[in-house]
Amino acid sequence: MRRERGRQGDSSSCERQVDRVNLKPCEQHIMQRIMGEQEQYDSYDIRSTRSSDQQQRCCDELNEMENTQRCMCEALQQIMENQCDRLQDRQMVQQFKRELMNLPQQCNFRAPQRCDLDVSGGRC
C-alpha cells in the first residue's frame, strides 16, 4: 500500500502517553533476559514472575498507548533512561539495548524508524 505521510502528531502527546503507561514490566522483562535467573539483580524479585508473563504484561502496557506505533520510540527511550543507572558496565548497556531493540518485534509491532536509543546524555 502506498503511503504519503503527513504530520505524525506532536511528540509532547507521545510523552504524555508514555508517562501514563507502566513500563516496569518491560524493564523487568529485559533485565530478566540479560541477567538470566542470576540472583545478583535484586532490585526486583525477578523470580516471582516468569519472563514470558512479564513480556505479555509489557506488550499489554505498550498497547495501552493510543498510538503505539508512533510513540514506540519514546517508550523505548524512557525504558533506557529508567534503567540506565542500573546497568553496571558497557557490555550490559549493549545487551540491554539489543534486547530493547527486539522488544517491538516480540510484541508484534514494527520497530520504530530513526529512533536514537543513546538518550542518556552519555550516562549509559
Epitope: 506532536d10 511528540s11 524508524q113 529512533c115
Partner: antibody, heavy 123, light 110 residues
Amino acid sequence: QKQLVESGGGLDQPAGSLKLSCKDSGFTLSTFYMTWVHQAPGKGLEWIANIKQDGSEKDYLDSVRGRFTISSDNTQNMVDLEMNSLTAADMAIYFCARNGLQDSYSGDFFDHWGQGTLVTVSS
Amino acid sequence: QPALTQPSSVSGALGGSVTITCSGTGSNIGHNYVSWYQQLPGSVPKLLMFDNTKRPSGIPERFSGSKSGTTASLTISGLQPEDEADYYCATWDADLSAVLFGGGTKLTVL
C-alpha cells in the same frame, strides 16, 4: 564508480512546471531511500522530499506538498521530482542524494550526492 | 529560519580545534540521529558524520561527533586550511515528518 546524475533543470515561468530526474550508476537504488535537497543561491541546504525506493513511503517539505511529486522507477534506476506551480522561492540548485536510512534504529544521512541541476524561475 | 540552530560562523587557529553546535528540540535532535555535512565553496555537500558519532570511510579521525539531549556537536581538531567550508547538521523531525538542516556554519581557519 558510484555516481548520481541529475537532469531536467532550466528556466521556467512562475506557475510553470519542470520535471527533474536523477539516474544512478554504480549502485542499485532499489535498496535505498532517495532524497531531493535544494540550495537557493547563497543560502543553506533545504530538504525537499524522501522516497523509499519501492514507492511505499514518501515524505515532503510542507511548502512543496501538493505541488511537487517524488517518484521512482526501479527498472531504470531513476528518481524523479515533478514540480508544479513554481514560484521564485523554488529557484535553486536541486541535488539528488542517496539516503542511508535503514528500516529501524538509524537516521537519515546522505552519503552520495549528484552534482546538482539549476532551476531558474523568472518571467 | 531553520528549526536547527547553528552559529553562522566560527574560526580557529591552524592546528587548533573548533566545535560547531547544532541545537534543536525533543521532536528532532532529542529523539533522532544527527548527521553532518561539509560543503566546500562551489562544491557538492559531503557526508562527515552520521548516526551522531559514526564517520564514513575516508573521513579523518580529527572529525568527531557527539550528541547530548537536544544539542549535537561536531568537533574538528588539527585544523587545516582545507577545512575552510560551510558545515551543516541534519536530522529528522517527528512532528513535521521532515528532514531538517541547520542554517550552516562558515568555518574560517586563521
